[in-house]
Interface confidence: low
């Protein structure tokens, strides 16, 4: 054998983040040499799954008919090939949304805003969270994610934007959660629809910090000024 | 308790056909593999066949593949195996297990106390 | 199918005694070897996985180690709720396979 066989591919359709009760198919593409595959879950006691392959034996199949909070994790899957196992794959984040009760998502001081003006979105909880998402539409990394300090559970986050430019504008949505498992969200808040108007042109906006090596406006995230302060923490959906 | 109940052994005649219980309790049943074992009066253990949790894969060992079928009702929490077209080397005792499947390990961390079938004229 | 030999068939041993017993697969299975005790009128329990990882709760006397087709099984301090029948398995390739068993008696 000339070195450990290559690492599967990894994902899930119709994709990662899936609202309570809905199904997901995972499925983990290795090689045609493949004779079984197997897939776990991290800090499951439960193993997690293994099939036979599909044909022509590249590829197997995991089906979840029905989420709940037990399938939400981390998960890696791996091939037996007739020399050996596989390397594990990279992992996939599967998350539940519906864990609980949605937010209320707002703009301060309001969703039209002026190009180069200030605009704060507000997630707010019925029940005290400690981690806050937003989600930006059609985004490529919609991500932002607010946790409070030292684990202290509060009722909203806000996520300042300054300056506004047309690519702030577009659908937003919240989500909240808690510190103990990251993979299980609240319901999405409504959408809020933000609208930028005006001449004040800024081709990228400048956060306060960046955290990504994003290519293009779309992939800058929005960076907290207020009082949650961010966790460092960021996951990319697709 | 993670228990399991094997039943629906007794005496059949050979050429005969018998179908085995194993109803399952205390774990999430239909998220496992579940498989049937089987062991002859003072012999070794022999792996008769497994089941996925949605059965959609089913595996046997070889020389059982056209006698016996494995089944599961995941609404009842229960596993079946019918036997068809039974011989006297079929009589042991029948147990139903739980494997654990992870990554490059695989064993049979859950096992029901058995039940026996014997072939007899 | 990978066959799994064990040997010997029976033991004799006494309490204290350290036992070693030897089983060995038909071509290669890398370390997929599990160990189990059954006792009399009881279903098999798990002792070892994965050739030489101890199972929850199970004593540390008990040890397995090996690779590829030859792997052991050792009781250090033999104790009297030891005797039983152990059986080796290979989770290396489907069907999955037993050795014939070892018996542990009393001298």
């Known amino acids: 054998q000339a070195g450990p066989l290559p690492k599967p591919t990894l994902w899930a359709e119709p994709g990662s983040v899936i609202s309570w009760g809905n199904s997901v198919t995972i499925w983990c593409q290795g090689t045609l040499e493949a004779r079984e595959y197997r897939l776990d879950k991290e800090e499951s006691p439960a193993p997690w799954d293994r099939q036979n392959p599909l044909e022509p034996k590249n590829k197997a199949r995991f089906s979840i008919p029905s989420m709940t909070e037990d399938y939400a994790g981390r998960y890696r899957c791996y091939y037996r090939s007739p020399v050996g196992w596989s390397q594990p794959s990279d992992p996939l984040e599967l998350v539940m949304t519906g864990a609980y009760s949605k937010p209320t998502l707002s703009a301060l001081p309001s969703p039209l805003v002026t190009s180069g003006k200030s605009v704060t979105l507000l997630c707010q909880s019925r029940s005290p969270m400690d981690t806050f998402l937003l989600i930006k539409e059609r985004a490529a990394h919609p991500l932002l994610h607010l946790r409070s300090e030292h684990g202290a559970q509060q009722h909203q986050a806000e996520f300042p934007m300054s300056p506004v430019t047309s690519v702030h504008g577009g659908t937003y949505r919240c989500f909240s959660s808690h510190g103990f498992s990251h993979y299980l969200l609240s319901h999405p808040s409504d959408p809020l629809e933000l609208i930028v108007s005006g001449s004040l042109e800024d081709p990228r906006p400048s956060p306060t910090r960046s955290v990504s090596t994003a290519a293009g406006p779309e992939d800058q995230p929005l960076m907290p000024t207020g009082s949650v302060p961010h966790s460092g923490l960021r996951r990319h959906w697709e | 308790e993670v228990k399991l109940l094997e039943s629906g052994g007794g005496l059949v005649q050979p050429g005969g056909s018998l179908k085995l219980s194993c109803a399952a309790s205390?774990?999430?049943?239909?998220?496992?593999?579940m498989i049937w074992v089987r062991q002859a009066p003072e012999k070794g253990l022999e792996w008769i066949g497994e089941i996925n949790p949605d059965s959609s894969t089913i595996n046997y060992t070889p020389s059982l593949k056209d006698k016996f079928i494995i089944s599961r009702d995941n609404a009842k929490n229960t596993l079946y195996l019918q036997m068809s077209k039974v011989r006297s080397e079929d009589t042991a005792l029948y147990y139903c297990a739980r494997p654990y499947y992870r990554y490059d390990v695989g064993y049979f961390d859950v096992w029901g106390a058995g039940t026996t079938v014997t072939v007899s004229s | 199918d990978i066959v799994m030999t064990q040997a010997p068939k029976v033991l004799l041993v006494s309490a204290g005694d350290r036992v070693t017993i030897s089983c060995k697969a038909s071509?290669?299975?890398?370390?997929?070897v599990v160990w189990y005790q059954q006792k009399p009128g009881q279903s098999p329990k798990l002792l070892i996985f994965y050739a030489s990882n101890r199972y929850t709760g199970v004593p540390d006397r008990f040890t397995g180690s090996g690779y590829g087709t030859d792997f052991t099984f050792s009781i250090s301090t033999v104790q009297a709720e030891d005797l039983a029948v152990y059986f080796c398995q290979q989770d290396y390739s489907s069907p999955w396979t037993f050795g014939g068993g070892t018996k542990l008696e009393i001298k």
């Open positions: 071509q290669s299975v890398s370390n997929a």
């Open positions: 205390g774990f999430d049943f239909s998220r496992y593999w």
